[in-house]
């Protein structure tokens, strides 16, 4: 069975990659970070 | 194509200002992010600002920051950076960079040599 | 803090294949990096991105020689068929959002030799 720690880790993997796309778009678009 | 070329660099005592400029061409200027990335002779990149499309938002380093300010004017198709109070370990090559919708640093200008010395 | 360790130097034969690591501090291995390649007396130039599962894009103009593969905290820029004109300095690179603040750091890059 797979644990909950690693649920957690695998659904938290790509929010550094989330943020950084957001911000690309935001440095184009101005988007307020907050 | 994509053209970044930077200038005003040259040399200039500590505690003086500089302020340098990169020219662009090939694409919509006023559409993307822009920074300056600076590497000293011999040694590593070090980023030193980003600033937004229309220029509403500024980032920089604790190591340049109140000393730097990154500008744009996009009815000119140029990006500039302002340093004051400049020390000797601000010494180095200073690249102009455009991002794209996948990365920071896409284009990379042919640089301009900053020398800080009495 | 945000830190990317990259071997100083590393050498191989022409035709060989090269596999170049970039390690990220282990708090923040998941985070997705961009590798650089900077020739001789030359600008820097962008090569790819490379995620925490592999995937990658590349930059213009880039050989498909020049792929990207993870595992943990390492991030590895492959080369094969090595040419003359791929000895460069090969350098890492990594930002990320905090509190409205952007950062971004940069290995201190591997010198690639091509020998032969």
């Known amino acids: 069975a797979v644990s909950e720690h690693q649920l957690l880790h695998d659904k938290g993997k790509s929010i550094q990659d989330l943020r950084r796309r957001f911000f690309l778009h935001h440095l184009i678009a101005e988007i307020h970070t907050a | 194509q994509v053209q970044l070329v930077e200038s005003g660099g040259g040399v200039v005592q500590p505690g003086r200002s500089l302020r340098l400029s990169c020219a662009a061409s090939?694409?919509?200027?006023?559409?993307?992010?822009m920074s300056w990335v600076r590497q000293a002779p011999g040694k590593g990149l070090e980023w030193v600002a980003t600033?937004?499309?229309?220029?509403?938002?500024?980032y920089y380093p604790d190591s340049v920051k109140g000393r730097f300010t990154i500008s744009r004017d996009n009815s000119k198709n140029t990006l500039y950076l302002q340093m004051n109070s400049l020390r000797a370990e601000d010494t180095a090559v200073y690249y102009c960079?455009?991002?794209?919708?996948?990365?920071?640093?896409?284009?990379w200008g042919q640089g301009t040599l900053v020398t800080v010395s009495s | 803090q945000l830190v990317l360790t990259q071997s100083s130097s590393a050498s191989f034969s022409l035709g060989a294949s090269a596999k170049l690591t970039c390690t990220l501090s282990?708090?923040?291995?998941?985070?997705?990096i961009e590798w650089y390649q900077q020739q001789p007396l030359k600008p820097p130039k962008y090569v790819m991105d490379?995620?925490?599962?592999?995937?990658?894009s590349t930059g213009d103009g880039i050989p498909d020689r020049f792929s990207g593969s993870s595992s943990g905290a390492e991030r590895y820029l492959t080369i094969s068929s090595l040419q003359s004109e791929d000895e460069a300095d090969y350098i890492c690179?990594?930002?990320?959002?905090?509190?409205?603040?952007?950062?971004?750091?940069f290995g201190g890059g591997t010198k690639l030799t091509v020998l032969g």
């Open positions: 960079a455009r991002q794209t919708t996948m990365t920071y640093f896409a284009y």
């Open positions: 090939g694409f919509t200027f006023s559409s993307y992010g």
């Open positions: 600033i937004s499309s229309g220029g509403s938002y500024t």
């Open positions: 282990s708090q923040h291995s998941t985070y997705t």
């Open positions: 490379l995620k925490q599962d592999g995937s990658h």
């Open positions: 690179g990594v930002g990320d959002t905090i509190k409205e603040q952007f950062v971004y750091v």
